[in-house]
Structures are given as C-alpha cells and as structure tokens.
Amino acid sequence: VPPGEDSKDVAAPHRQPLTSSERIDKQIRYILDGISALRKETCNKSNMCESSKEALAENNLNLPKMAEKDGCFQSGFNEETCLVKIITGLLEFEVYLEYLQNRFESSEEQARAVQMSTKVLIQFLQKKAKNLDAITTPDPTTNASLLTKLQAQNQWLQDMTTHLILRSFKEFLQSSLRALRQM
C-alpha cells in the first residue's frame, strides 16, 4: 500500500494532511519495508547475509555512503548540504536499483516498488531543496556500462552484489531518515 493510503489514515478523518516532512518520512519507511522483504528473499536463497567475504565484492561497487563531511551528522549538521547529499546519493543508487530488477523471483513486484518509490522520494526531496544546481545527476553512459559490468559477473558475485546493494541502500535511507527528522 503506497504511503498515505493505509487504513490508519482512513480511520482518522480528523487528521491533518501530511506535512512535507511526514510524507517524506512515510515514503522512506515504505521503501525500507520493501528492502526488508527483498533482503529476506536474498538471505533465504544464499548465505550472503552471514558471509565475511563482502570486501571482495565491495571493491567493484561505489555505493553512496554518508560521511561527516556531508553535513548530515549532528556534528557539523548543515541542512542544505545534507539535502544535496541525500538527493545525489539516491540518484546514484538508481542504477543499482535497476540492477536489482531481475534478481528476484518471488519478490519481483517488491523490487519494482522499491525502485518506483525511490523515484517518488527523489521528487519529494527535490521540492524541499533550495539549491538544485548543486545536485549532480549521474552520467547515463557511465550507468549503462556499470549495469552491463554488474550483470556480467559470475553468480556468486551477483548474489553478493545484490546483498551489498540492499544493505547499503538500507543504511543510506536510515541515515537520511535520521537527518531529515532534524530539519
């Protein structure tokens, strides 16, 4: 159920319309639900979730990660810098979410929902951002070649890549959720 359409909202007609912050928060929680379902399938299918060989595959990936310099941590918190980092990071994750699309059997729809919901989240955040010029959009050609490279990996590496994408995306969203609630 997309955010804003759950039974809780229906049952409370007196409730004020969701604020921008609440809508964003709800959207992130919805995506995290999707990631949780995808991680379940990944962990059931392989032993990647307990693997200690993650570093081998992580070298091939350049997954977005929050660092102190991004302005999203309490120490040195900067709303605008942080917002730019969140949007840029989500845009960078899009190619990895595209990679996930053919990686699931029973959760195929869930993978699509995570991808589409992330696009909606980016739109919400872009409306909130003042400095859209600072947001760098990934180069489509670079993304296309990265996608080809990822899809050409052997089965073990593809499983590991799937696991790492989900884990990193979850962490990035949680860091974003935390920072956005301080704005």
């Epitope: 604020t19 609440e22 928060d25 929680r29 995290l32 949780s36 929050m66 999203c72 941590f73 309490q74 120490s75 884990r167 979850k170 962490e171 949680q174 860091s175 959720l177 935390r178 609630r181 301080q182």
Partner: antibody
C-alpha cells in the same frame, strides 16, 4: 539475548569527571539502525535523556548538558563510554544505558541496563 | 526542544479495572511516541513503540493510540504487576524527551 550493563564509580566528588562504561552483548553496534543511549533518573524524579551514539558514529547530546558530555564507542569491545565533566551534587542519579534498534529509527529503547547509582 | 506532558501525574485503580493515561507533545511528532513502564527500583521497560505497536512480550491488555500531538495508553483488566510509573517519550527527533510520568497505584 541482548544485555547491557553499566559500570563506573558510585561516588564522585564535586568538579570531578564521571566516566561510565556500558558493556553490551547480543547485538553489534556496527549494524545499521542500531544505537546506544544514556538516560539518567534522579531519585524520585523523571527520566532524562543524556546522549546517544549510532552505528555510524553520529552522536547526539542533550542541549543543556552538551558542553559536559562526551560519548564514544568501541565496536570491537562492545562498549560505549560516557564521560561527564564538572560533576555537581544535582547530578546524583541512577544512570542507565539502553539500546535502540529498529529499521525505522523510532528512537525507542527496547533493552535497558540495570542502572548504576552515582552520588 | 519538544516538550512532553503527561496526565494525570498519579492515579489509583483496582485489579480488573481499566485506566487511560495521556501524553501531549508540544509539536507534531507524527506517530513517533514510545511508552515505558518502570517499577520501583527497576529499569524502565518498553511497552509500546511508534504510538500503537506493542513490544514483543507485552500483554494485549495494553493499548497505545494517537498521532501528531495527542497520545493515550490504555490498560484494560489491571493486574497487580501493572503498578509503577509510566513514561512517554518523543521518538521523532533529538533531543529525546520524556514526559514527567504517570504513577499508577493498584
């Protein structure tokens, strides 16, 4: 099974620095979404949140005590340390460490230590 | 900072009764409200998180509800072990803040 245990001095002189250690087991402070916080409770009074540290080392402090507090973690030792400078008799309280761990960051403390009374 | 106010500060009831206590936030905290129970000499225990979700192991006679700024905790069919103090907590943003507590005497 998740457990947390506070340790440190029970008696501190005014102006001294209090150092409390929270030793935990049953979870890792390198897992995303996981954090450890400190909460105190003066005798017969309400709970007061002091500090919080996240899996990624992001730290939060109570604004009224921020200048006196430092929170750090040692992931390999499964420990979180809180230091509080310039102690005063009004800081007499039971100090608790507690864990927060959920995907949506509800900032809820699902497991608490037994607490340590500092006078 | 978000201020949390609890009412009443104390109440007494009999075994088998039902009681409701309230918690107000000084600004909207969405559904990020947590409830704790503390018995004398013990550490607090999480009862309800995110306004209405019962923590694992908490009896179904406890029920949390509310959103934005107004929240309630209802306990049906009171048991002797329910005595103690109940605290609400803002879980929306830092600094984390607790209410002053509601002391329940059975």
């Amino acid at each position: 099974q998740v457990t947390l245990k506070e340790s440190g001095p029970t008696l501190v002189k005014p102006t001294q620095t209090l150092t409390l250690t929270c030793s935990f087991s049953g979870f890792s402070l390198s897992t995303s979404g996981v954090g450890v916080g400190w909460v105190r409770q003066p005798p017969g009074k309400a709970l007061e949140w002091l500090a919080f540290i996240w899996w990624d080392d992001d730290k939060y402090y109570s604004p009224s005590l921020e200048s006196r507090l430092t929170i750090t973690k040692d992931t390999s030792k499964n420990q979180v340390v809180l230091t509080m400078t310039n102690m005063d008799p009004v800081d007499t309280a039971t100090y608790y460490c507690a864990r927060s761990a959920d995907d949506y960051l509800y900032y809820s403390f699902d497991t608490w230590g037994q607490g340590t009374l500092v006078t | 900072d978000i201020q949390m106010t609890q009412s009443p500060s104390s109440l007494s009831a009999f075994v088998g009764d039902g009681v409701t206590m309230t918690c107000w936030a000084s600004q909207s905290i969405n559904d990020y409200l947590n409830w704790y129970h503390q018995r004398p000499g013990e550490a607090p225990e999480l009862l309800v998180f995110a306004a209405s979700n019962l923590q694992i192991g908490v009896p179904s006679r406890f029920r949390g509800s509310g959103s934005e700024t107004y929240f309630t905790l209802t306990i049906n069919s009171l048991q002797p072990e329910d005595s103690g103090t109940y605290f609400c907590q803002n879980g929306w943003s830092f600094p984390l803040t607790f209410g002053g507590g509601t002391k329940l005497e059975i």
